[in-house]
Interface confidence: medium
Amino acid sequence: EVEKTACPSGKKAREIDESLIFYKKWELEACVDAALLATQMDRVNAIPFTYEQLDVLKHKLDELYPQGYPESVIQHLGYLFLKMSPEDIRKWNVTSLETLKALLEVNKGHEMSPQVATLIDRFVKGRGQLDKDTLDTLTAFYPGYLCSLSPEELSSVPPSSIWAVRPQDLDTCDPRQLDVLYPKARLAFQNMNGSEYFVKIQSFLGGAPTEDLKALSQQNVSMDLATFMKLRTDAVLPLTVAEVQKLLGPHVEGLKAEERHRPVRDWILRQRQDDLDTLGLGLQGGIPNGYLVLDLSMQEALS
């Protein structure tokens, strides 16, 4: 707590300007009016206040707005935002995308801090859903943002927002997250033609069920191995050798290099060896000829 001391004669601040940077902590406290600071917040960014001076300025705003800052002040916080705690931010009501952008800009180039995470959470909750413009903004600043959300949080993403998602935004998503996003993407891109549809849906295919992979195999999509390796194992297992060959097209040769890795390894174990041999890749580990193949999933369903 900064002690209350009288402002020395002639030092009362008439505006927020560079002359204040040589004010000592107690002088700032005594000579800068909180209301003046609030109305001239946009100037703070253009003045290189020190670490301790920023504490004083924050303290003045906290006293002026004990229930939380108004958006007119929040939008112009600039680097003073970095002094805010998650507890401070929870008191805010941020509704403008411009305010969000201005504060994310301050943290640009750094990992998502607890302050930023709290700000985003407040903003999204205030909006009720992750609309396209918000998602666009968040993924521009934090490509991994989408994958940091829980499947429950992702369920509030409307299909229309999926258009804002870039392939790199999904790099760190796990299968549970893709399970939620894939149906939304399928819906969002449903009116596109075959090749365009595949380009858009490709990044989301880690959440695709078997029947959709079978349908894709009929469309000459030539899926690359990197995409194939990210597919759900349970969705790949029921595919026949012919379907995988059609799905991968010229990329089918890449299966040899991946034969020890999932889902390729598990898929090989489910195929007849003579079917695998038709690929001419030397894939080994299939079911030997003459063995009876029991479809255990069918058996479980019957029992």
Partner: antibody, heavy 120, light 107 residues
Framework: QVQLVQSGAEVRKPGESLKISCKGS????????IAWVRQMPGQGLEWMGI????????IYSPSFQGQVTISADTSISTTFLQWRSLKASDSAIYYC?????WGAGWFDPWGQGTLVTVSS | AIQMTQSPSSLSASVGNRVTITCRAS??????VAWYQQKPGKPPKLLIS???SLESGVPSRFSGSGSGTDFSLTISSLQPEDFATYFC?????????FGGGTKVEIK
């Protein structure tokens, strides 16, 4: 990447004027504070002052106030440090450096330095 | 102005040694301290900000600690490329000031 490139070494006589430069690239030049730091031969580092190129309003360390002038030209992304009348004691390496953080913080990156020699 | 007193002004050490450099501020400055490394003929290079926050790309053998008035930079296992001069800097209040430097030499 963020880079600061300084003008070359200078040799001057006492009483002469001099203007050295620091060109920024790889970031928004207008929106970052640039500082000038002096290092006298075999000595430590001294902060001289800073400028916010967006409004070209320099702030000087009390020790350097009135001794030098800091300016900027945003059209060529360049900051300048100048002397009207050099003294032998101005001989030093001068570095420009970007404030790596908001406000008054630490410096990163630094220019390669400009060696100024003042000798009769 | 806040004075930053660095010690020692020089030290000799061998590769693999643990080295600690200290910096004392003339008044409390929270954790508003940065550390730099400077090699002959080169500009300083930022190692640590906020007293202990390691910059990206800086080897983990470097670490910083302290708050208030006493700060230290530690190199856990000195490598040949670490022989240089190290400076501390306070950014708590104006004018920004640096320590006098510590030269780390090969024993």
């Amino acid at each position: 990447q963020v880079q600061l490139v300084q003008s070359g070494a200078e040799v001057r006589k006492p009483g002469e004027s001099l203007k050295i430069s620091c060109k920024g690239s790889g970031y928004s030049f207008r929106d970052s504070w640039i500082a000038w730091v002096r290092q006298m031969p075999g000595q430590g580092l001294e902060w001289m002052g800073i400028i916010f190129p967006g409004d070209s309003n320099p702030i000087y360390s009390p020790s350097f106030q009135g001794q030098v002038t800091i300016s900027a030209d945003t059209s060529i992304s360049t900051t300048f440090l100048q002397w009207r009348s050099l003294k032998a004691s101005d001989s030093a390496i001068y570095y420009c450096a970007r404030h790596a953080a908001w406000g008054a913080g630490w410096f990163d990156p630094w220019g390669q330095g400009t060696l100024v020699t003042v000798s009769s | 102005a806040i004075q930053m007193t660095q010690s020692p002004s020089s030290l000799s050490a061998s590769v693999g040694n643990r080295v600690t450099i200290t910096c004392r501020a003339s008044q409390g400055i929270s954790s508003a301290v940065a550390w730099y490394q400077q090699k002959p003929g080169k500009p300083p290079k930022l190692l640590i900000s906020y007293a202990s926050s390691l910059e990206s790309g800086v080897p983990s053998r470097f670490s910083g600690s302290g708050s208030g008035t006493d700060f230290s930079l530690t190199i856990s296992s000195l490598q040949p490329e670490d022989f240089a001069t190290y400076f501390c800097q306070q950014f708590n209040s104006y004018p920004l000031t640096f320590g006098g430097g510590t030269k780390v030499e090969i024993k």
